[in-house]
């Protein structure tokens, strides 16, 4: 089948990094500068992505693969293949339309991206707050009171996983 196909379509013999040049009697020609073909049998080469402005080149374009971009310091990637760069904020902040804003009391963000999330509500699991939350960190819930009573066994059996409560204390 492959032999038949190649007899019918000489372009199928053109490897990645080349294109089947109709202007030159379907000869396999190398991709021109700043273009690539990642698969064989291509009739055109794709234009290389250019990482400009807030984008930074993570991997140079080659004849067989596109360039890959990431973001300059102070920004982070969003979208498939880093299609967008979004401004970083500090931990304890979130990005709004008006720029970086501190997390409201009762919420935290431990990353430079994303939104402020409510502190865990320990009492929903029958626990109490062991370490207070901050703008940058969630609270730490202590063990359940049953774990602290005299004669409590040292090793507790695993409990079924539950989502943490997410309303502020």
């Amino acid at each position: 089948f492959e032999r038949t196909r190649s007899l019918q379509d000489p372009c199928s013999n053109c490897p990645a990094g080349t294109f089947c040049d109709n202007n030159r009697n379907q000869i396999c020609s190398p991709c021109p500068p700043n273009s690539f073909s990642s698969a064989g049998g291509q009739r055109t080469c794709d234009i290389c992505r250019q990482c400009k402005g807030v984008f930074r080149t993570r991997k140079e374009c080659s004849s067989t693969s596109n360039a890959e971009c990431d973001c300059t310091p102070g920004f982070h990637c969003l979208g498939a293949g880093c299609s967008m760069c979004e401004q970083d904020c500090k931990q304890g902040q979130e990005l709004t339309k008006k720029g970086c804003k501190d997390c409201c009391f009762g919420t935290f963000n431990d990353q430079k991206r994303g939104i402020c999330r409510p502190w865990t509500n320990c009492s929903l699991d029958g626990k109490s707050v062991l370490v207070n939350g901050t703008k940058e960190r969630d609270v730490v819930c202590g063990p359940s009171p049953a774990d602290l009573s005299p004669g409590a066994s040292s090793v507790t059996p695993p409990a079924p996983a539950r989502e943490p409560g997410h309303s502020p204390q």
């Epitope: 969630d138 202590g142 063990p143």
Partner: nanobody, 117 residues
Framework: QVQLVESGGGLVQAGGSLRLSCAAS????????VAWYRQAPGKQRELVAV????????KYADSVKGRFTISRDITKNAVDLQMVSLKPEDTAVYTC??????????WGQGTQVTVSS
Amino acid sequence: QVQLVESGGGLVQAGGSLRLSCAASGSIFSYNAVAWYRQAPGKQRELVAVITSGGETTKYADSVKGRFTISRDITKNAVDLQMVSLKPEDTAVYTCAALRNSGSTSWGQGTQVTVSS
């Protein structure tokens, strides 16, 4: 759940020091915090010290402040408790706990610390 194993307990004279270690079978720092508790016979288990997974916050019981230091050892996947100026009232079984806000707490089996006068 992570398996926790404490070591470093023993018999020591008042004024002496011990270093307890809590080693974990899995990543101990994926938990919200790791704490040391102690329990004397017939008494409730009490918090000694706690350290958050990132190491940015530590908290101590008033009775051990200035004498005990909790720290992370990332290379050993462990949390240590350095105890100095030990007193007879520090005698107890010391147990480490990996604390997770959702779900249950993982406990070690404990290590005995006895301080003689």
